[in-house]
């Protein structure tokens, strides 16, 4: 019996065709993805062949305008017209808090939305019983499927689970839930999640039962043979791990954004066990032609945001660098912009001492989302700003102690190299780290703006002294494991929102032209 | 246990109103849609229309958007219909359903109106 | 407004036959059809949604398919408390609209 897995993951609001790079689209023949494209493909593979499914596997939410101003409807929308069969829940999913997947996604949604580890207590277990489930079993052709889901633990650290969800050990919570679809005679088990290709592959080395694994989370690109653009494959699709129990388990992603879609083949023998498995990822090009109804619905529902996003804020006339690539790994214009403006925001107090009251900024790497491509006429929208600031964020004020900041910029590069998103950009600090030393040992230099000056200069950081800092509200409350900073601030103001920041900053200067100027070294 | 009960039968006099009730228990009643479909003998069924516990928000059948409104109480876990300005052709039973996954999952027993002088 | 166009709108079937109602739609409705049963005087009973998924306790001779705009509903054994009227309803776009109904009775 063979069974076809069309699979998507971290879309993070890609609903309209992007440019390569997945940032915003500006020559149409030659962009990629969107959903009126997947729901071509998608309806071709169904016509073709009898026993398909349609897995979502997290990260819906969160990453442009349209979750910006729709908040999630649109995702229940669009992954309803589509026809999904099931979701995971990924860990932006909880970007709003509970209430902003409940209300949206959860009880509009026309599939099962899965995941096995996370558990409600309190007032909340009874509010959002039956709204996820551990696992679906679902009917396909004359067989049935079951699908277990699992979310990242880390998601408190990442999110706005708020405190009445409890993020269990994935493998811990899957195991018991996979026993119990083998004991309704449940023999084809697909696990579905969103806690990265590490945890997919352990996932299936050590849970009993797991025939698939379907995975999310570390935006990982597989492919055999030659890749189709610019994504190198982390290994082979599918990735075959062998399990502790001596199965061969097929782990597959699909990279991110609605770029591809994944798609595997699996044969299972009649004891449901997995004979073969081949597929690739499907490369959405305009070689495949959007849906017309699905265009045309997209572009009913795009009015609200042209209002809310079109007009222009102002001009780069070079090309702002926010991708991955770099802010996770070096001093990246986009951060350096970025920063700039979080200081310019804070511009007041200033007296015949101080020549203003903050001088220093950090902005997690991780939290810059996209590039902003200059050859569109130099043209920036706040459309274009809140797929670089896509969490709907506050740059906050903080006052930390000298030994704090050291700590940060340790952790910044503790596991440096990983594409991790707590490596810091900065603004009014000049950082030299020996990546050659211990991690927790690797700050060698690290400089700070006065501000007490009339003319600014850089001194080094004083273990001893109170500094004001501005920050994302993601870091001042300990995100990307910046527990340091939660736990020893000693004071949090909290500040304007974070795309209006930029955005404001970007109307004020007209033009910009940020450069990779030698702050991080 | 999920129940959806409905007040009892009503016989009102044309022209009235009335309202029917739909008490849910069992489950979160804010995490799931309520919807009333209208069975009568000459038109079978019919969709009146939806609404969301947690908020009020409503959505109808814009052949009912002059005839029903629905609302809720939170706090006693009610659905509420109101029917206005009732005809003969308004003699029917209504029935309240919880929706998941936008379909329905459990109704309730039903509640008959008989419109008559 | 979809149209939904249920046959037969009445059958007569012998225990342990295999019946098969269809509803034919007016416009694709991607998959997004439920059937259910109502006994006289009792209120309805949701059997199906997605066209294919059994509600849990349902018996398992009973199933759906389709897709776009043709579904069927099928009970493969037919056994006597199976006797009722059965329908179909969309609920792809808003309004939701029902079939007429099949009326099943005992050979």
């Known amino acids: 019996w063979e069974l076809t897995i069309l699979h998507t993951n971290d879309v993070h609001s890609r609903l309209e065709q992007t440019s390569e790079d997945s940032s915003k689209c500006v020559n149409a023949s030659r962009c990629m993805g969107g959903v009126a494209r997947l729901f071509t493909k998608v309806q071709q593979i169904r016509r073709a062949e009898p026993n398909v499914l349609l897995l979502d596997a997290g990260d819906q939410y969160q990453g442009t305008i349209w979750f910006t101003v729709y908040k999630g409807a649109e995702v229940a929308h669009f992954m309803n017209a589509l026809r999904y069969d099931a979701m995971a829940l990924g860990n932006h999913e909880f970007d709003n808090g509970v209430e902003g997947l409940i209300e949206p996604l959860l009880k509009e949604a026309k599939f099962p939305i899965l995941s096995a580890n996370i558990k409600a207590k309190g007032p909340l277990a009874s509010q959002i019983s039956g709204l996820y489930l551990p696992y679906k079993v679902l009917p396909v052709g004359d067989e049935v499927v079951g699908i277990v889901g699992y979310t990242s633990k880390e998601t408190p650290f990442l999110s706005n689970p708020g405190t009445n969800l409890v993020f269990e050990d994935e493998i811990t919570a899957l195991q018991p839930e996979v026993d119990k679809l083998k004991t309704l005679n449940v023999n084809k088990i697909i696990a579905l999640g969103h806690s990265g290709f590490e945890t997919d592959k352990l996932i299936a080395q050590k849970v009993r039962g797991v025939d698939v694994v379907v995975g999310g989370h570390s935006n990982t690109f597989l492919y055999t043979g030659n890749p189709p653009s610019k994504e190198v494959p982390a290994g082979k699709y599918p990735f075959i791990v062998t399990s502790d129990d001596g199965r061969k388990v097929p782990v597959v992603q699909a990279y991110a954004f609605g770029k591809y879609l994944g798609y595997l083949k699996i044969e299972f023998d009649e004891r449901g066990n997995v004979i073969s498995s081949h597929g690739n990822p499907i490369l959405l090009n305009s070689s495949i032609p959007e849906d017309p109804s699905i265009k045309a619905d997209i572009n009913k529902w795009r009015i609200k945001l042209d209002n809310y996003s079109t007009q222009e804020l102002g001009k780069t006339i070079v090309y702002l660098d926010g991708s991955s690539q770099s802010c996770r790994f070096r001093e990246c214009n986009m951060g350096n912009l970025i920063c700039d403006a979080m200081i310019n925001n804070n511009l007041r107090h200033a007296d015949e001492m101080f020549w203003n009251h903050v001088s220093m900024c950090i902005l997690n790497g991780g939290g810059i989302r996209s590039p902003i491509d200059e050859r569109n006429n130099g043209t920036i929208t706040w459309e274009n700003l809140a797929a670089v600031l896509p969490f709907g964020g506050t740059f906050d004020l903080v006052q930390l102690k000298g030994s704090t900041l050291k700590k940060a910029f340790e952790h910044s590069v503790h596991r440096y190299g990983q594409s991790t998103g707590e490596f810091l950009q900065v603004g009014g600090i000049h950082v030299v780290y020996d990546l050659s030393r211990k991690p927790g040992d690797r700050v060698v230099k690290l400089d700070v703006l006065c501000t007490k000056c009339r003319v600014p200069s850089y001194d080094p950081l004083k273990m001893d002294e109170i500094y004001k800092v501005i920050l994302p509200n993601f870091l001042a409350n300990g995100g990307d494991g910046f527990q340091m900073i939660k736990d020893e601030l000693l004071r949090h103001d909290s500040g304007d929102q974070d795309i209006n920041v930029v955005s404001t900053y970007i109307s004020k200067m007209k033009v910009i032209y940020p450069a990779v100027e030698g702050r991080i070294k | 246990e999920v129940q959806l009960q409905q007040s009892g039968p009503e016989l009102v006099k044309p022209g009235a109103s009335v309202k029917i009730s739909c008490k849910a228990s069992?489950?979160?009643?804010?995490?799931?849609?309520i919807h009333w479909v209208k069975q009568s003998h000459v038109k079978s069924l019919e969709w009146i229309g939806r609404?969301?516990?947690?908020?009020?928000?409503?959505t109808y059948n814009q052949n009912f958007k002059d005839k029903a409104s629905l609302t809720v109480d939170k706090s006693s876990s009610t659905a509420y219909m109101e029917l206005h300005s009732l005809t003969s052709e308004d003699s029917a039973v209504y029935y309240c359903?919880?929706?998941?996954?936008?379909?329905?999952?459990?109704w309730g027993q039903g509640t008959t109106l008989t419109v008559s002088s | 407004d979809i149209l939904m166009t249920q046959s037969p709108s009445s059958m007569y079937a012998s225990l342990g036959e295999r019946v098969t109602i269809t509803c034919k739609a007016s416009q694709d409705i991607n998959t997004y059809l439920t059937w259910f049963q109502q006994k006289p005087g009792k209120s309805p009973k949701t059997l199906i949604y997605?066209?294919?998924i059994l509600v849990d306790g349902v018996p398992s001779r009973f199933s759906g398919s389709g897709s776009g705009q043709d579904y069927s509903l099928t009970i493969s054994s037919l056994e006597f408390e199976d006797m009722g009227i059965y329908y179909c309803?969309?609920?792809?776009?808003?309004?939701?609209?029902f079939g007429a109904g099949t009326k099943l009775e005992l050979k």
């Open positions: 997605r066209a294919n």
């Open positions: 359903a919880r929706f998941h996954y936008g379909a329905p999952d459990y």
């Open positions: 309803l969309q609920y792809d776009e808003f309004p939701l609209t």
């Open positions: 069992g489950y979160s009643f804010t995490g799931y849609y």
């Open positions: 609404i969301n516990p947690y908020n009020g928000a409503t």
